[in-house]
C-alpha cells in the first residue's frame, strides 16, 4: 500500500530511452499518441511530471527502497493525464483521471546502471514499461539478469543541467522553459 496520498516530491524531467531517443506525446481531448523517436536539433523535449510516493515494501516485489520501503512514481505529461499500465493489452496508455489515481498509474522505480531507471507495474510485478516497435509497451522480465535489458531502461536527464526541477505548484505549471527558473527550485536528482 502507498503510504499517504500525497507525493513526497515531484520532478519535471524529460524521458528518453537507453539509446537516447525521446518519449514524446501528441495529446488531444479524445485521442493521443505516444512516440519513441529522434528529435530535431532545435526541438524541445517533452517533459513528464514524476510524482514520487513512498510505499511499504511487499515481499513479492523488488523495488529499490530502504528500510522496507520503496519508491513508486506516477508519470504525467500534462495536467490531469497520467500514464497507465494496461496489463491485458500489454500496452502503455494515457488516461485522463482525477485523484486518487488507480493502481495502474503507479510504477515501482528501479535505479539501474548508467544513470538509468526502469518502471515496474505496481499491478503486475515483473512487468515493466519498455520500448517495442518505436512505441511504449509493457514487457515481461523473467529473471533479474534481464532487468538490465536495454529496452526497459530509461534516462531522466537532459543536456541542460538546469532541466530537472523540483516542482512548486506543478499542477498549474504550463509555461515555457524560459520562465521555468522563476517557477521552480533547481534540484539535482541523484541515482
Amino acid at each position: 500500500s502507498i503510504t499517504g496520498i500525497s507525493p513526497i516530491t515531484e520532478y519535471l524531467a524529460s524521458l528518453s530511452t537507453y539509446n537516447d531517443q525521446s518519449i514524446t506525446f501528441a495529446l488531444e481531448d479524445e485521442s493521443y499518441e505516444i512516440y519513441v523517436e529522434d528529435l530535431k536539433k532545435d526541438e524541445k523535449k517533452d517533459k513528464v511530471l514524476l510524482s514520487y510516493y513512498e510505499s511499504q515494501h511487499p515481499s513479492n516485489e523488488s523495488g529499490d527502497g530502504v528500510d522496507g520501503k520503496m519508491l513508486m512514481v506516477t508519470l504525467s505529461p500534462t495536467k490531469d493525464f497520467w500514464l497507465h499500465a494496461n496489463n491485458k493489452e500489454h500496452s502503455v496508455e494515457l488516461h485522463k483521471c482525477e485523484k486518487p489515481l488507480p493502481d495502474q498509474a503507479f510504477f515501482v522505480l528501479h535505479n539501474m546502471h548508467s544513470n538509468c531507471v526502469s518502471f515496474e507495474c505496481k499491478t503486475d510485478p515483473g512487468v515493466f514499461i519498455g520500448v517495442k516497435d518505436n512505441h511504449l509497451a509493457l514487457i515481461k522480465v523473467d529473471s533479474s539478469e534481464n532487468l538490465c535489458t536495454e529496452n526497459i531502461l530509461f534516462k531522466l536527464s537532459e543536456t541542460n543541467p538546469a532541466f530537472l526541477y523540483k516542482v512548486v505548484g506543478a499542477a498549474d505549471y504550463k509555461d515555457d522553459d524560459d520562465k521555468a527558473a522563476h517557477h521552480h527550485h533547481h534540484h539535482h536528482h541523484h541515482h
Epitope: F25, L27, D29, K40, D42, K47, D172, K174, D175, D178
Partner: antibody
Amino acid sequence: EVQLLESGGGLVQPGGSLRLSCAASGFTFSSYAMSWVRQAPGKGLEWVSAISGSGGSTYYADSVKGRFTISRDNSKNTLYLQMNSLRAEDTAVYYCARDLWIQLWGGGLRYPFGYWGQGTMVTVSS
Amino acid sequence: LPVLTQPPSVSVSPGQKASITCSGERMGDKYAAWYQQKPGQSPILVIYQDTKRPSGIPERFSGSNSGNTATLTISGTQDMDEADYYCQVWDSSTGVFGGGTKVTVL
C-alpha cells in the same frame, strides 16, 4: 466538433483601439495554447501573438509588441486581442487558431495550428 | 528569425506532381508545417512535423525537410488542390510563415 468564432472587427481610425474576441467550443479550452494570425488583403499569413493554456505566458511578433495584448478567459472559453495605437499596416483579416495538441508541461510554442476560425476583418483608415 | 522563402507560383497539369519548396537557414533542424488556403476561406493544416498528415488530408499530400529546404509534394494533383500554400515553423517561441505559393492547376 472544434469551433472558433472571431468577432470585434471593424473600421477604426489610425491611433485607435479595437478588441477582438474568439469564442471557442468543442474542446477543453484551457488545455491548449492559442494564437492570433493575420492576413493583409492580397498578402500572406503573419503570426501575431500567442498565449499558453493557463494564460501565464504570452508571446508577440515584433511588429505588434507594446501595442497589442493577448489574453484569455478560460471560464468563458474566450480568447482576446486588445489592439491599441492601430496603424494602416494592421489592416487585415485576423484569425484565431488553436494548437493541434494539448500543451504539455513547460511546452512553450511548438505545435502547428490545427484549427482556425473564419476570421474577422480589421480596417485601419482615416 | 529565419526568413522562409517560397516560390510565388507553381503551375501543374491535373494528375501530375507539384512540388513547393520552403527555404530557410537550418530549416532541417526545425519541424515544418504546411497550410492550404483557398480563396475566401481559412487556412487548413495539411502537413505537420515535416511529413505527417492530419486525419482527413488525402495521401497525395506529402512532405520532407532536410538541409535548408522543406518541400510539400502533391502527387496526382487534382483541380481541388488549386490554392495558396504556406510553410510555417516556430523559432524561439515566435511563429514564422513563408510568403506563400499559389498553385495553379492548368
